[in-house]
Interface confidence: low
């Protein structure tokens, strides 16, 4: 299953697949979740190790058994791959390290006046991988504002240096926000020349194309199909790259088929994992197990369940098969992709969904064994849960925010039903940014049920608590997926970094806005939530957030939207936007309903009709 | 000191190819851009391009792009910038300059081409 | 490309006298304004550049100000040295662009 928990001050011994710099343990843990055999990380932060040469180590590692002996080194940061958690699966990587200085080629030096400029400019650049920025402070004027676009061979930087005054990212052409655009197009017949940065072999020229997306260099590839001329040429797909970031030459060559990467597709790209399965075709690796299991579907099932399957065949052969079960072979090779593609077989074959970002049905929680006020300008895919809830009658209009915590269920506050419980009036929106992309012909959810907290009562700010289920799922993509839930019982205090979002009002007499504002928020205790509201009960099941001398807070429109926080790399639900005395009056908190507190009754109601829980519980 | 030696006059025939180096030293020659600014004879300045000689990246003024094309040696620390299919109105003083934080700080002392028949 | 528009094209002075050159980008180019001198068969010389930096070799009667499009070049007390061209150059946005160049000359 999916393990999120990061061990502290602990080193994984032995099984290293592969080693390289990462910044963060965040970004080394999406490198192992994306290596076709890490199953374990440990890295390494510079305060945890004097050896300059193993600082911002990132240590990718394999294990047969899943696990690995843990020995105590004080600063390292362990933990799992994110394969098979499904919406948690993501090559997105936002974050800016400031003191940081990410070593790598760099081909382009520009002039500009701040590090999202130069984050900007690093995702519209075809070969950008990550970038440096000097900012106006930096000790030599020389390289003031520099923005040093770079790249390398493994797409991480060839070396992290602790440098002041310097700031550091990636490009977020894996978050689908890149302004280049991409070629959906597949040319049959034609071959594409240039330099070639890898080989594998795959069933068809899309799997050939996912694999180029998701590679640091590929730009485009060549794949010869299994009637190509040279039979051991069959079935390779050759990963491609080039100077100006376009082949310099393409030959028509009957039996080929070539394209691109569809890295710098802009709001959506293909999920990291293949679904297909191909019908008489056998595909070879080495031997992980063979289970005996009825029909191919299930046989992929098992591959997925199997952490360290990376492909499968299902053998159809008699002597194969005992009454309806036949034989499934789970198998993984050095690269994830099969040592061998065989037609005209008895078999099925097809590869592991362990990549796959929709991943189960269920809600997402943490596992371990009202405009905003004083708020900024959101940007695309930044709140990816963050929905708006639209009323429809005569007009229609912005009414409260919500969040989306699986394929069909949204969570919001109570009190946005309140004179309006009739589910056929409601459109819920999801994936936008600005209220004004809304048109008559944008797609839209409808309510197939509410559900409002049994103990909520109209007027009263307790149990502010509702449920949405949707009419027909979501599918996940960067701009549209859901948050996190805490564990039952989670403690705030943890949670240092918090934020909430929505398009309410940005002044207590103002006006719903119409791009989604953000703002952050720290947390404040329930004692002194409730010195500031004498005349309410502030209980354990609400959660407080705000300045003391106010200026930012959620408002009217926000209600129902998220209170979200930062921990350990991962966002969670803490609270969602209820009630407070005005709009970011001083000494006046928000008040928010503490998710945490209804756990169980969300596990509950979002049981499906069968029985099966739509969620994984918090353990 | 930081100093850049450019190359000597050089007279061209239209159509020809004209190459003009420009040596560094006083300085990390990786570590800084080269750029090269022309100005035609009573004319203003002209930017036509830089290089980066750590990595060999290139970044051209579209106005130039397909004739003009900037190299590097970093065994001599000389940096070269040739324009070909040279015109009448390519008659100037090319200079490579060294920026320092954002503008140009230092200058070659200049190298005048003339295309004539 | 971001065009720069300096006036005037030539003024003449006396030495003593205040000298303001205008430069004006056709988009904003945030402060990333830099002023050259260039003296007959020279190379030019970095003069002034962003909100504060002023080159080393040159004398504080050489101001720059100016926000967004707008920037001007204030020679407080002009000085017989002075007599010059001065460019202003955009380093915002590439192509960086100059000036056509403001010719100061003793009246």
């Known amino acids: 299953g999916c393990l999120t928990q990061l061990y502290e001050n602990a080193f994984f011994r032995g099984g290293d697949v592969a080693s390289m710099y990462t910044p963060n343990a965040q970004y080394c843990q999406m490198r192992c979740t994306f290596h076709p055999r890490c199953l374990l990380f440990s890295f390494l932060p510079a305060s945890s190790i004097n050896d300059m040469e193993k600082r911002f180590g990132c240590f990718l590692k394999d294990s047969v058994t899943g696990t690995l002996p843990k020995v105590h080194r004080t600063g390292a940061v362990s933990g799992h791959s994110l394969k098979q958690c499904g919406h948690q699966i993501s090559a997105c990587h936002r974050d800016i390290y400031k003191g940081v200085d990410m070593r790598g080629v760099n081909f382009n030096v520009s002039k500009v006046s701040s590090v999202e400029e130069c984050q900007k400019r690093c995702t519209s650049n075809i070969r950008c991988q990550f970038f440096s920025y000097a900012t106006q402070t930096f000790h030599k004027a020389e390289y003031r504002n520099n923005c040093l676009l770079k790249y390398s061979p493994g797409g991480t930087p060839t070396a992290i240096k602790v440098l002041s005054n310097v700031e550091s990212g990636f490009s977020l052409k894996p978050c689908a926000l890149s302004e280049i655009g991409c070629h959906m197009n597949i040319f049959q017949h034609l071959a594409f020349s240039d330099v070639d940065v890898a080989r594998v072999l795959t069933p068809d020229a899309f799997v050939c194309r996912t694999i180029c997306t998701y590679h640091p260099n590929c730009l485009f590839f060549t794949f010869y199909t299994n009637v190509w001329k040279i039979e051991s040429q069959r079935n390779v797909c050759l990963l491609k790259t080039s100077e100006s970031g376009t082949p310099s030459s393409s030959t028509p060559q009957e039996n080929t088929i070539s394209g691109y990467s569809l890295l710098t597709c802009k709001r959506t790209l293909p999920e990291p994992c293949h679904s297909k399965i191909y019908p008489g075709v056998d595909f070879g690796g080495e031997e992980l197990n063979v289970t005996f299991v009825k029909g191919v579907n299930v046989c992929q099932e098992t591959c997925t369940k199997m952490i360290r399957c990376q492909f499968f065949t299902y053998s159809l052969l008699p002597e194969d098969c005992k009454e309806e079960k036949c034989k499934c072979f789970l198998r993984l090779s050095m690269d994830g992709s099969p040592t061998r593609i065989a037609y005209g077989t008895q078999g099925s074959s097809g590869y592991s969904l362990r990549l796959c970002n929709t991943g189960d049905n269920s809600v997402c929680t943490t596992k371990t064994s009202t405009r905003i006020v004083g708020g900024t300008n959101s940007s695309w895919g930044e709140w990816p849960w963050q929905v708006s809830l639209q009323v429809k009658l005569t007009a229609q209009r912005h009414l409260c925010g919500g969040s989306l915590i699986g394929h069909q269920w949204v969570l919001t506050a109570a009190h946005c039903f309140d004179g309006l419980p009739l589910q056929d009036v409601w459109r819920i929106y999801s994936g936008i940014l600005n209220l004004s992309d809304i048109t008559k012909d944008t797609p839209f959810s409808q309510i197939k049920e509410i559900i409002i907290h049994q103990n909520y009562k109209v007027s009263e700010g307790n149990h502010d608590i509702a449920l949405i289920k949707l009419q027909a799922p979501l599918n996940y993509t960067e701009f549209q997926k859901p948050i996190c839930l805490p564990s039952k019982g989670d403690t705030s205090t943890i949670y240092t970094n918090c934020w909430v979002t929505g398009w309410g009002f940005s002044k207590e007499k103002g006006e719903i806005q119409n791009i989604l504002q953000k703002v952050n928020i720290p947390l404040v205790t329930n004692e002194e939530c409730q010195k500031r509201y004498q005349d309410y009960k502030i209980t354990q099941r609400m959660v407080c957030a705000g300045y003391k001398e106010g200026g930012k807070d959620a408002c009217k429109g926000d209600s129902g939207g998220p209170l979200v926080c930062k921990h350990n790399g991962m966002w969670r639900l803490v609270g969602i936007t209820s009630w407070g005395e005005g709009c970011a009056r001083r000494e006046q908190p928000g008040v928010y309903t503490k998710v945490a507190e209804y756990m169980d009754w969300i596990l509950e109601k979002t049981q499906s009709s069968d029985g099966k829980a739509q969620m994984q519980s918090p353990a | 000191q930081v100093q850049l030696q450019q190359s000597g006059a050089e007279v061209k025939k239209p159509g020809a190819s004209v190459k003009v180096s420009c040596k560094a030293s006083?300085?990390?020659?990786?570590?800084?851009?080269m750029h090269w600014v022309r100005q035609a004879p009573g004319q203003g300045l002209e930017w036509m391009g830089a290089?980066?000689?750590?990595?060999?990246?290139?970044a051209y003024n579209q106005k130039f792009k397909g004739r003009v094309t900037m190299t590097r040696d970093t065994s001599t620390s000389t940096v070269y910038m040739e324009l070909s299919s040279l015109r009448s109105e390519d008659t100037a003083v090319y200079y490579c300059?060294?920026?320092?934080?954002?503008?140009?700080?230092?200058w070659g002392q200049g190298t005048l081409v003339t295309v004539s028949s | 490309d971001i065009q720069m528009t300096q006036s005037p094209s030539s003024l003449s002075a006396s030495v003593g006298e205040r000298v303001t050159i205008t430069c004006k980008a056709s988009?904003?180019?945030?402060?990333?304004l830099a002023w050259y001198q260039q003296k007959p068969g020279k190379a030019p010389k970095l003069l002034l550049y962003?909100?504060?930096g002023l080159e080393a070799g040159f004398h504080l009667r050489f101001s720059g100000s100016g926000s967004g499009t707008h920037y001007t070049l204030t020679i407080s007390s002009l000085q017989p040295e002075d007599f010059a061209t001065y460019y202003c150059?955009?380093?915002?946005?590439?192509?960086?662009?100059f000036g056509q160049g403001t010719k100061v000359e003793i009246k």
């Open positions: 006083g300085y990390t020659f990786t570590d800084y851009e």
């Open positions: 290089i980066h000689p750590g990595s060999g990246g290139t």
């Open positions: 988009e904003d180019i945030y402060n990333r």
């Open positions: 150059q955009q380093y915002w946005s590439t192509p960086w662009t």
């Open positions: 962003g909100e504060t």
């Open positions: 300059a060294r920026p320092y934080g954002y503008p140009f700080a230092y």
